[in-house]
């Protein structure tokens, strides 16, 4: 019989190098039965986790699994770091293991920006 | 002018292949991500696929593993290769601009600001 | 994936009048990731509104954009002949960046 408590299937020690302006999904698989549990994303910061709330995040389903994914629209290069993603299910709190990301800078910060950057620079976002 | 231009569409049979282009300038091609959206007949707006500044790509469920999307950024070139067409690949093609990454932390997502005019690509026996 | 539905499927208003188009999301979208779209028949969409609600570059300003969540509203103050097309709403916070299936928005 098989188990019903949530499961999160991040691998021990998983990582992810990845080029910063670049599109990204982190995906957090998920296993569960009836009612789908919440679960968010953190980044590790030491010893604690901190919970990315104003991040884009959606639900894929699949036949035998779901997915958590947070979407990185795009990879910047202080998304560098360790991420967990953590279920709240029937009052108990399921934590997966933590997956890392391995951002590189393919454009460094000594490049002199470009004529788009230089023009926008008061509407350039960051996070 | 900020413009993106397209060409490569036409008439094919199922099962056949077909590349699409698409040629930018009036902007700094290299630092934007792309994307291709299509449109059927009478229907709506799909995206079908994104290729990052550098070179990351997603894909609709719809065409993955049929379809590549690439870039040649010393050509300020897009591009999609289209292999095992079907009746419903047939469309007209978008090609559009997406989000800004300068360096650093500096990025800008307004969506899709800037469209290519159209290619279609007609899939038939 | 992220499941947008716009309502109503057309809208028949004059010329002068207010119009409203809904947009809601299956899960919820960071406003900052909302778009709304106009495309006229034979041409390329073209943006009006990107981050639920801040106006494109040239887009006049009967056209505004509110809305989070799940919920987002593309309204136009005062409708010209030329506001006449098909709009549509998407979420491009990440892949598969959805589209609503449009709303019609057609001369009474």
């Known amino acids: 019989k098989e188990s019903c408590d949530v499961q999160l299937y991040i691998k021990r020690q998983s990582e992810h190098s990845i080029l910063a302006g670049d599109p990204f999904e982190l995906e957090c698989p998920v296993k569960y039965c009836a009612n789908r549990p919440h679960v968010t994303w953190c980044k590790l910061n030491g010893t604690t986790c901190v919970k990315l709330e104003d991040r884009q995040t959606s639900w894929k389903e699949e036949k035998n699994i779901s997915f958590f994914i947070l979407h990185f629209e795009p990879v910047l290069p202080n998304d560098n770091g360790s991420y967990r993603c953590s279920a709240n299910f029937q009052s108990n709190l399921i934590e997966s293991h933590s997956t890392t990301l391995y951002v590189t800078d393919v454009k460094s910060a000594s490049e002199r920006p470009s004529k788009d950057e230089m023009a926008s620079r008061p509407w350039l976002l960051y996070r | 002018e900020v413009q993106l231009v397209q060409s490569g569409g036409g008439l094919v049979h199922p099962g056949g292949s077909l590349r699409l282009s698409c040629a930018g300038s009036?902007?700094?091609?290299?630092?934007?991500?792309m994307h291709w959206v299509r449109q059927a007949p009478g229907k709506g707006l799909e995206w079908v696929s994104v290729?990052?500044?550098?070179?990351?790509?997603y894909y609709a469920d719809s065409v993955k593993g049929r379809f590549t999307i690439s870039r040649d950024n010393a050509k300020n070139s897009l591009y999609l290769q289209m292999n095992s067409l079907r009746a419903e690949d047939m469309a007209v093609y978008f090609c559009?601009?997406?989000?800004?990454?300068?360096?650093?932390?500096?990025?800008?997502?307004?969506?899709?600001?800037?469209w290519g005019q159209g290619t279609t690509v007609t899939v038939s026996s | 994936e992220i499941v947008l539905t716009q309502s109503p499927g057309t809208l028949s208003l004059s010329p002068g009048e207010r119009a409203t188009l809904s947009c809601r999301a299956s899960?919820?979208?960071?406003?900052?990731?909302l778009a709304w779209y106009q495309q006229k028949p034979g041409q390329a969409p073209r943006l009006l509104i990107y981050?639920?609600?801040s106006r494109a570059t040239g887009i006049p300003d009967r056209f505004s954009g509110s809305g989070s969540g799940t919920d987002f509203t593309l309204t136009i103050s005062r409708l010209e002949p030329e506001d006449f097309a098909v709009y549509y709403c998407?979420?491009?916070?990440?892949?598969?960046?959805?589209f609503g299936q449009g709303t019609k928005l057609q001369i009474k």
């Open positions: 998407q979420q491009y916070g990440g892949s598969p960046y959805t």
């Open positions: 981050g639920a609600s």
């Open positions: 009036g902007f700094t091609f290299s630092s934007y991500a």
């Open positions: 899960q919820s979208v960071s406003s900052s990731y």
């Open positions: 290729i990052g500044p550098g070179g990351g790509t």
């Open positions: 559009a601009r997406g989000y800004y990454y300068g360096s650093g932390n500096f990025f800008k997502n307004y969506g899709m600001d800037v």
